[in-house]
């Protein structure tokens, strides 16, 4: 069953899933210049059974100038800068995405792909969360969000995930600059350091992190 | 929760235009295509186009090329479609459609009536 | 223009039957289909993607089948609620197209 929203957005940060549940849609997208070919699909669809799962259909772009019922538009100003990809703090390491029964792996990029991804995730479907480069992480609880069913509506939980902008302690977790003692750390600080199984958890999400992972269309 | 607000009704005379809108809410507006869907007694559902807000592109149905267009405000994450030159065929209830239809608005009645 | 065709226009059926409404397509849209539920008066709700996947809070009585050029969408334990209009839509191909509807009456 489809989440009826998207996962909740956290200033700074991005979130990506380790790998998809069955039924997860992803928009075929197409940069700038760019659209869906005429008979292309809508979006790839994470297909299968518990044994076996793969992505149903294909994304393919072709030049937007070649279809004379599809314009481009001025975007709003806010809009006419590129989309930037996301980074993350440190380059993300491929997981074995087989061996979790009924999910489909990170699909591969497609042929003038846009910069962004859009999902639309299915109930059940777990996302984690990473600050982007420059933030320092601080935890207070899982740096993750799950998607529920609760009375026939979906919600997805909230990450317990702050994103600071402090550029000078933005070294892995691990790597901090040495401490006289705990002791000398504010307090706040203290309570919510990330710890490396923390990090280890999100470096293991998937290889290729893109930005903010969304976009759809519908033609 | 994701919402698509549209007006009730418009009332309009035949050969004029009307500009309606669609106000989305819950989502990111500029990562989703709104869509335009119309709907008329014995006609079933037809498509009419769809406008990516973030993007900037927009497709039509080339039944409804002339008739309808697009645009979109992300400032206020509301798309819009104007309908010109206006017959007694344009009377129908006009859905703005998100998500990949799996939203839809509550629908705009159009009455073209002298 | 892809045709989607509701051979049926009316069906009739008592609570607690079963159901099926079919469609057809004009040509191989292999699983690009969405069922959609319109009750009098309402605009139109998405029960089916992908021809057999559920959207959130659709019952687990409405079951989607089908690929190629011919689709199914099967209501088991017809209830009284489910009286409605059923639509199915492809969008393997532009303009996506709608069936003309099939009108559900509940004896």
């Known amino acids: 069953e489809l989440c009826d929203d998207d996962p909740p957005e956290i200033p700074h940060a991005t979130f990506k899933a380790m790998a998809y549940k069955e039924g997860t849609m992803l928009n075929c997208e197409c940069k700038r210049g760019f659209r869906r070919i005429k008979s292309g699909s809508l979006y790839m669809l994470c297909t299968g059974n518990s044994s076996h799962s793969s992505w149903d259909n294909q994304c393919q772009c072709t030049s937007s100038a070649t279809r004379n019922t599809t314009k481009q538009v001025t975007p709003q100003p806010e809009e006419q800068k590129e989309r930037k990809t996301t980074e993350m703090q440190s380059p993300m390491q491929p997981v074995d995405q087989a061996s979790l029964p009924g999910h489909c792996r990170e699909p591969p990029p497609w042929e003038n792909e846009a910069t962004e991804r859009i999902y639309h995730f299915v109930v059940g479907q777990m996302v984690y969360y990473q600050c982007v480069q420059g933030y320092r992480a601080l935890h207070r609880g899982p740096a993750e969000s799950v998607c529920k069913m609760t009375h026939g509506k979906t919600r997805w939980t909230q990450p317990q995930l702050i994103c600071t902008g402090e550029m000078e302690t933005s070294q892995f977790p691990g790597e901090e600059k040495p401490q006289a003692s705990p002791e000398g750390r504010p307090e706040s600080e203290t309570s919510c350091l990330v710890t490396t199984t923390d990090f280890q958890i999100q470096t293991e999400m998937a290889a290729t992190m893109e930005t903010s992972i969304f976009t759809t269309e519908y033609q | 929760q994701v919402q698509l607000q549209q007006p009730g009704a418009e009332l309009v005379r035949p050969g004029t235009s009307v500009k309606m809108s669609c106000k989305a809410a819950?989502?990111?507006?500029?990562?989703?295509?709104i869509g335009w869907v119309k709907q008329r007694p014995g006609h079933g559902l037809e498509w009419i186009g769809d406008?990516?807000?973030?993007?900037?592109?927009?497709n039509y149905n080339e039944k409804f090329t002339g008739k309808a267009t697009l645009t979109a405000d992300t400032s206020s994450s509301t798309a819009y479609m104007q309908l010109s030159s206006l017959t007694s065929e344009d009377s129908a209830i006009y859905y703005c459609?998100?998500?990949?239809?799996?939203?839809w608005g509550q629908g705009t009645l159009v009455t073209v009536s002298a | 223009d892809i045709q989607m065709t509701q051979s049926q226009k009316f069906m009739s059926t008592s609570v607690g039957d079963r159901v099926s409404v079919t469609c057809k397509a004009s040509?191989?849209?292999?699983?690009?289909v969405a069922w959609y539920q319109q009750k009098p008066g309402q605009s139109p709700k998405a029960l089916i993607y992908?021809?057999?996947y559920r959207y959130s809070g659709v019952p687990d009585r409405f079951t989607g089948s089908g690929s190629g050029t011919d689709f199914t969408l099967t209501i088991s334990n017809v209830q009284s609620e489910d009286l409605a209009e059923y639509f199915c839509?492809?969008?393997?191909?532009?303009?996506?197209?709608f069936g003309g509807g099939t009108k559900l009456e509940i004896k």
């Open positions: 459609v998100s998500r990949n239809f799996a939203n």
């Open positions: 040509q191989n849209v292999g699983t690009n």
């Open positions: 819950g989502y990111t507006f500029s990562n989703y295509w």
């Open positions: 839509q492809q969008y393997n191909s532009y303009p996506w197209t």
């Open positions: 406008i990516h807000p973030g993007g900037g592109y927009i």
């Open positions: 992908s021809a057999s």
